[in-house]
């Protein structure tokens, strides 16, 4: 049931639930936005990012896209709707528990994405092989 | 209406565990609809937010009381429940369990009466 | 986490007076504000929510209004049962954090 001030003051179409009939509650995500970052050659990273911070939308995931160019290394940490793309790419991953790192085509770049859709999921990046979702492990969690 | 009842000691020693139970009526702990959460007011200052906990078992604890925090529930008795572990003076509070509509994620919308813990030997 | 500073501590008015209270975040806090009322020996009582609406059987006289780090809540008409400590409380940022409260006395 939705409380009567929530009935009027929210629209319809703001109302988020998942496939049990359930309410989806806002999510919280590290968001910095982009940040220097020292992540390189390691298989996972610690985002580094201060601000959790709660989505707009109940349907936003976190994502995280990790840069190298010639002069420096960003980790940017933000909510966003993965319906829409983001730097163009679409989130793929996002039902995901864990924010798995994917190499995407970027010229002059380096350029990494993953999203997930668990508390603070992106504040920890994982770049390692053993997590991609060739394993059927992960496989399951994500799609249980 | 939902309607929410703290319960457990009112005194409680330096070092020992706080322990209290939120008892809820007029709707159910495992609805989607809502979460649930604990905060405590120490005598004549402000309120502070310890953590909370949505239906799908995801909780969320204040940072600076995170290693010392377990928010738990009983879906068969309707009720959760709070221990914090280590106790000092300054834990000493008004401590309210309360509930808010889940899309308004932080909002609280249903408070109990709230109970007196002191932290003494 | 973002600190929340309320003014002015105290609001000395009569009934029938409007009251401003002011409420103003150390950081945007995007319109993720909300505003409580507490009563001595009583628990709070959400007045407003994301800076604007009125919670279930709250009167017309309270209104909320700003957004990013300057937020007021406005009592149109003080009534007798409107003196009490007003907390402000934002959910941007987590943990939620809250003001340090005003109170609204009688002058």
């Known amino acids: 049931t939705i409380p009567p001030h929530v009935q009027k003051s929210v629209n319809n179409d703001m109302i988020v639930t998942d496939n049990n009939g359930a309410v989806k509650f806002p999510q919280l995500c590290k968001f910095c936005d982009v940040r220097f970052s020292t992540c390189d050659n390691q298989k996972s990273c610690m985002s580094n990012c201060s601000i959790t911070s709660i989505c707009e939308k109940p349907q936003e995931v976190c994502v995280a896209v990790w840069r190298k160019n010639d002069e420096n290394i960003t980790l940017e940490t933000v909510c966003h709707d993965p319906k829409l793309p983001y730097h163009d790419f679409i989130l793929e991953d996002a039902a995901s528990p864990k924010c798995i790192m994917k190499e995407k085509k970027k010229p002059g770049e380096t350029f990494f994405m993953c999203s997930c859709s668990s508390d603070e999921c992106n504040d920890n990046i994982i770049f390692s092989e053993e997590y991609n979702t060739s394993n059927p492990d992960l496989l399951l969690v994500i799609f249980q | 209406q939902l309607q929410l009842q703290e319960s457990g000691p009112g005194l409680v020693k330096p070092s020992e565990t706080l322990s209290l139970t939120c008892t809820v009526s007029?709707?159910?702990?495992?609805?989607?609809?809502?979460?649930w959460g604990w905060i405590r007011q120490p005598p004549g200052k402000g309120l502070e937010w310890i953590g909370s906990?949505?239906?799908?078992?995801?909780?969320y604890y204040s940072p600076s009381l995170k290693s010392r925090i377990i928010i738990s529930e009983d879906t068969s008795k309707n009720q959760f429940s709070l221990k914090l572990s280590s106790v000092t003076a300054a834990d000493t509070a008004v401590y309210y369990c309360?509930?808010?509509?889940?899309?308004?994620?932080?909002?609280?919308?249903?408070w109990g009466q709230g109970t007196l813990v002191t932290v003494s030997s | 986490e973002i600190v929340l500073t309320q003014s002015p501590a105290t609001l000395s008015l009569s009934p029938g007076e409007r009251a401003t209270l002011s409420c103003r975040a150390s950081?945007?806090?995007?319109?993720?504000l909300a505003w409580y009322q507490q009563k001595p020996g009583q628990a709070p009582r959400l007045l407003i929510y994301d800076a604007s609406n009125r919670a279930t059987g709250i009167p017309a006289r309270f209104s909320g209004s700003g957004s990013g780090t300057d937020f007021t809540l406005t009592i149109s008409s003080l009534e007798p049962e409107d003196f009490a400590v007003y907390y402000c409380q934002q959910r941007s940022n987590w943990p939620p954090t809250f003001g340090q409260g005003t109170k609204v006395e009688i002058k």
């Open positions: 950081q945007s806090v995007r319109s993720f």
């Open positions: 906990f949505y239906y799908s078992g995801i909780t």
């Open positions: 007029g709707g159910s702990i495992s609805s989607s609809s809502y979460s």
């Open positions: 309360a509930s808010g509509f889940t899309m308004i994620r932080g909002a609280l919308d249903y």
